[in-house]
Interface confidence: medium
């Protein structure tokens, strides 16, 4: 399976909400011996590989933000912990999974990574990740709402606040 990032760059004004999205697709074994672990974290563009470093998002680690389920089931993170930090990660039946960040500040700017781990019964594991940049802007140059730039082309798209 693969992970696609719908947008490679999100540019948002301070105070806005944004939903960063990844999609995983490809053959998925829905058997009882396969489970999916999905999560989000911040990172930096490393020399060897992007997303190898896993930093917290607003003090929540990738373990705090993880979604864990079999097949294409929908899932949500623990509401209490994440929502206290203005965060929520979610997953739907179609392979989309996202993290919503509320009331953005300049400190939220950076590289965000989504990670999907397919864990097979016994010991097989397959890991893929996607990366996207979030730029939070303030002042007169800031957009009035979030603008998302698609991964495949430079056409931008206005996205509504979450």
């Amino acid at each position: 399976f693969k992970v696609a990032t719908l947008y490679s760059l999100y540019v948002c004004p301070e105070g806005q909400n944004v939903t960063l999205t990844c999609r995983f697709f490809g053959p998925v074994d829905k058997g009882h011996d396969v489970t999916f672990y999905k999560t989000w974290y911040r990172s930096s563009r490393g020399e060897v590989q992007t997303c190898s470093e896993r930093r917290p998002i607003r003090n929540l680690t990738f373990q705090d933000l993880h979604l864990h389920h079999g097949g294409h089931q929908a899932a949500n993170t623990s509401h209490d912990l994440a929502q206290r930090h203005g965060l929520e990660s979610a997953s739907d039946h179609h392979g989309n999974f996202s993290i919503t960040m509320r009331n953005l500040t300049l400190l939220d700017s950076g590289l965000y990574c989504c990670l999907v781990v397919e864990i097979r019964h016994h010991h097989s594991e397959h890991r893929v990740h996607g990366a996207m940049e979030l730029q939070v802007q303030t002042g007169k140059d800031a957009p009035s709402s979030c603008v998302a730039y698609p991964s495949s082309s430079q056409e931008s798209e206005n996205i509504t606040a979450a």
């Epitope: 489970t35 490393g46 060897v48 470093e53 373990q63 864990h68 019964h121 594991e125 890991r127």
Partner: antibody, heavy 120, light 107 residues
Framework: QVQLVQSGAEVKKPGSSVKVSCKAS????????ISWVRQAPGQGLEWMGG????????NYAQKFQGRVTITADESTSTAYMELSSLRSEDTAVYYC?????????????WGQGTLVTVSS | DIQMTQSPSSLSASVGDRVTITCRAS??????LNWYQQKPGKAPKLLIY???SLQSGVPSRFSGSGSGTDFTLTISSLQPEDFATYYC?????????FGQGTKVEIK
């Protein structure tokens, strides 16, 4: 804060078995692999095997295959390691260690260790 | 099995020294390498994961580098609490294997 608390020290006779427990608290138990790593006196670290509680079936190092059994009880958030046919060279400190996710094998939390002494 | 070879097996250094420990894998493990610190009577502590990423809460004087078969752990300025034994560990394939350890002693 995640904590792994292991059972107390054991003294065993050669040929017998020992079962060491590892109780996890402060985090989701089922999603993470728990491995067992041993360390003989003055020696290095040796991985014995591990288990992801949601699956229940363990993955063992070939060296210990047939002699070690790793299990997990999700209801009590406890993992167990049983080693049979003990010999003197099994005298070691046995650690349980949690992988940061799945079978990632980076051990971010460790138990305090359980000393198992095999002596006649 | 993947063999992990650390060097040196022991070293003597003073507070403030720059210390480098190397680890070599018998076959390529990409960046699936972790470093641990262990003090006598204590469990190991994860310092570096994925060859170069600093584990949360670990001082920035610790750094890791390398990929493939050759890896390095560097302590930029040795502190009194850093005197311990350091282990590398490959996480590429089972059985998981560790280096034999490097003991860092006070000169």
């Amino acid at each position: 804060q995640v904590q792994l608390v292991q059972s107390g020290a054991e003294v065993k006779k050669p040929g017998s078995s020992v079962k060491v427990s590892c109780k996890a608290s402060g985090g989701t138990f089922s999603s993470y692999a728990i491995s067992w790593v041993r360390q003989a006196p003055g020696q290095g670290l040796e991985w014995m095997g591990g288990i992801i509680p949601i699956f229940g079936t363990a993955n063992y190092a070939q060296k210990f295959q047939g002699r070690v059994t790793i299990t997990a009880d999700e209801s009590t958030s406890t993992a167990y390691m049983e080693l049979s046919s003990l010999r003197s060279e099994d005298t070691a400190v046995y650690y349980c260690a949690r992988s940061s996710y799945g079978w990632s094998y980076e051990f971010d939390y460790w138990g305090q260790g359980t000393l198992v002494t095999v002596s006649s | 099995d993947i063999q992990m070879t650390q060097s040196p097996s022991s070293l003597s250094a003073s507070v403030g020294d720059r210390v480098t420990i190397t680890c070599r894998a018998s076959q390529s493990i990409n960046t699936n390498l972790n470093w641990y610190q262990q003090k006598p009577g204590k469990a190991p502590k994860l310092l570096i994961y994925a060859a170069s990423s600093l584990q949360s809460g670990v001082p920035s004087r610790f750094s890791g580098s390398g990929s493939g078969t050759d890896f390095t752990l560097t302590i930029s300025s040795l502190q009194p609490e850093d005197f311990a034994t350091y282990y590398c560990q490959q996480a590429r394939d089972t059985p998981i294997t560790f280096g034999q350890g490097t003991k860092v002693e006070i000169k």
